[in-house]
């Protein structure tokens, strides 16, 4: 069971300092951006991270949403990353959810974050290059210190 707490506005970057944004096709991608580019591309670069209390504490439970016209929320349904047309819910009456991730700091690196799926244990949000695009995907952690599953989260409130 998850109950919504507060939300904050954040910019999310991979460890190559590329900024996460949602493109015109509602795809979450990473791109090199100056701070000015990041501001100019808002709200597509500004993510709403909503925190949830968890009846089984397993780290900080969060949803990740973006408001471009309508609010959309990140989902990993069937291990495929997409944005669903929905607000962060008030409650989720389940112990797992495709839209809940556990945000945890990387041991020894308090400023680096990982997001583990609550639906798929051991699977994390990751940045993966596919042709010329840097995509947000769900990836099974296969090695310690995998930089592709680490991010920085900069609060914009």
């Amino acid at each position: 069971y998850f109950g919504k707490l507060e939300s904050k506005l954040s910019v999310i970057r991979n460890l190559n300092d590329q900024v996460l944004f949602i493109d015109q096709g509602n795809r979450p991608l990473f791109e090199d951006m100056t701070d000015s580019d990041c501001r100019d591309n808002a709200p597509r670069t500004i993510f709403i991270i909503s925190m949830y209390k968890d009846s089984q504490p397993r780290g900080m439970a969060v949803t990740i949403s973006v408001k471009c016209e309508k609010i959309s929320t990140l989902s990993c349904e069937n291990k495929i990353i997409s944005f669903k047309e929905m607000n962060p819910p008030d409650n989720i009456k389940d112990t797992k959810s495709d839209i809940i991730f556990f945000q945890r700091s990387v041991p020894g690196h308090d400023n680096k974050m990982q997001f583990e799926s609550s639906s798929y244990e051991g699977y994390f949000l990751a940045c993966e290059k596919e042709r010329d695009l840097f995509k947000l995907i769900l990836k099974k952690e296969d090695e310690l210190g995998d930089r592709s599953i680490m991010f920085t989260v900069q609060n914009e409130d």
């Epitope: 929905m86 607000n87 819910p89 989720i92 389940d94």
Partner: antibody, heavy 122, light 113 residues
């Protein structure tokens, strides 16, 4: 034939509690998201709460958040609304309404029950 | 929250004449990604629950007579009853489902002149 039948309404004092039920029939209840909508006497409609068909997704109106709890039992084809810390302004006919959306988010209401009256008064 | 404002509050129309009800949202309910307006219309007769008439601003619900039609886009919408019948006496509500909380207009009462 789709049927939604509400029960559990009645008179209660301020700060009291009530539990409303909605018995559904004529459709596969577990496949549909469900809502509660209320209507104060002589007034308009106010959406109260939503429970998705899958994923356990719940939304509430700000006016009831923290006081009302929506739940469902797919095995019993039933939707519930637990109402605590009731106030005078909660006096209304409460309708159970089926959502057209089977997803994670409320849309519009294609079937409604007849409603059950909740009166909060000292 | 999106505020829905209906006008007029009440309307008296002769049998067989056209009735027009307006609904205005405080912000757009048109989602450009799918070009859909997230707006529905309901009819509520005295002592009865509401009944869905129109969704996606202009799609008529199955079984609803074709004298009922919905139009508009963005923030301004209209429900039209092309030829008012005695059984159309009711209160009509618009509702947005663009974002939570879902919100309704205040209602328009339609009567026979």
């Amino acid at each position: 034939e789709v049927q939604l039948v509400e029960s559990g309404g009645g008179s209660v004092q301020p700060r009291g509690s009530l539990r409303l039920s909605c018995a559904a029939s004529g459709f596969t209840f577990s496949s549909y998201s469900m809502n509660w909508v209320r209507q104060a006497p002589g007034k308009g409609l106010e959406w109260v709460s939503y429970f998705s068909s899958s994923g356990g997704i719940i939304y509430y109106a700000d006016s009831v958040k923290g006081r009302f709890t929506i739940s469902r039992d797919n095995a019993k084809n039933s939707l519930y609304l637990q109402m605590n810390s009731l106030r005078d302004e909660d006096t209304a006919v409460y309708y159970c309404a089926r959502d057209d959306s089977s997803g994670y988010y409320p849309y519009f209401f294609d079937y409604w029950g007849q409603g059950t009256l909740v009166t909060v008064s000292s | 929250d999106i505020v829905m404002t209906q006008s007029p509050d009440s309307l008296a129309v002769s049998l067989g004449e056209r009735a027009t009800i307006n609904c205005k949202s405080s912000q757009t309910v048109l989602y450009r990604s799918n070009n859909k307006n997230y707006l529905a219309w309901y009819q509520q007769k005295s002592g009865q629950p509401p009944k869905l008439l129109i969704y996606w601003a202009s799609t008529r619900e199955s079984g609803v007579p074709d004298r009922f039609s919905g139009s508009g886009s963005g923030t301004d919408f209209t429900l039209t009853i092309s030829s008012l019948q005695a059984e159309d006496v009711a209160v009509y509500y618009c509702q947005q489902y663009y974002s939570t909380p879902l919100t309704f207009g205040g209602g328009t009462k339609v009567e026979i002149k």
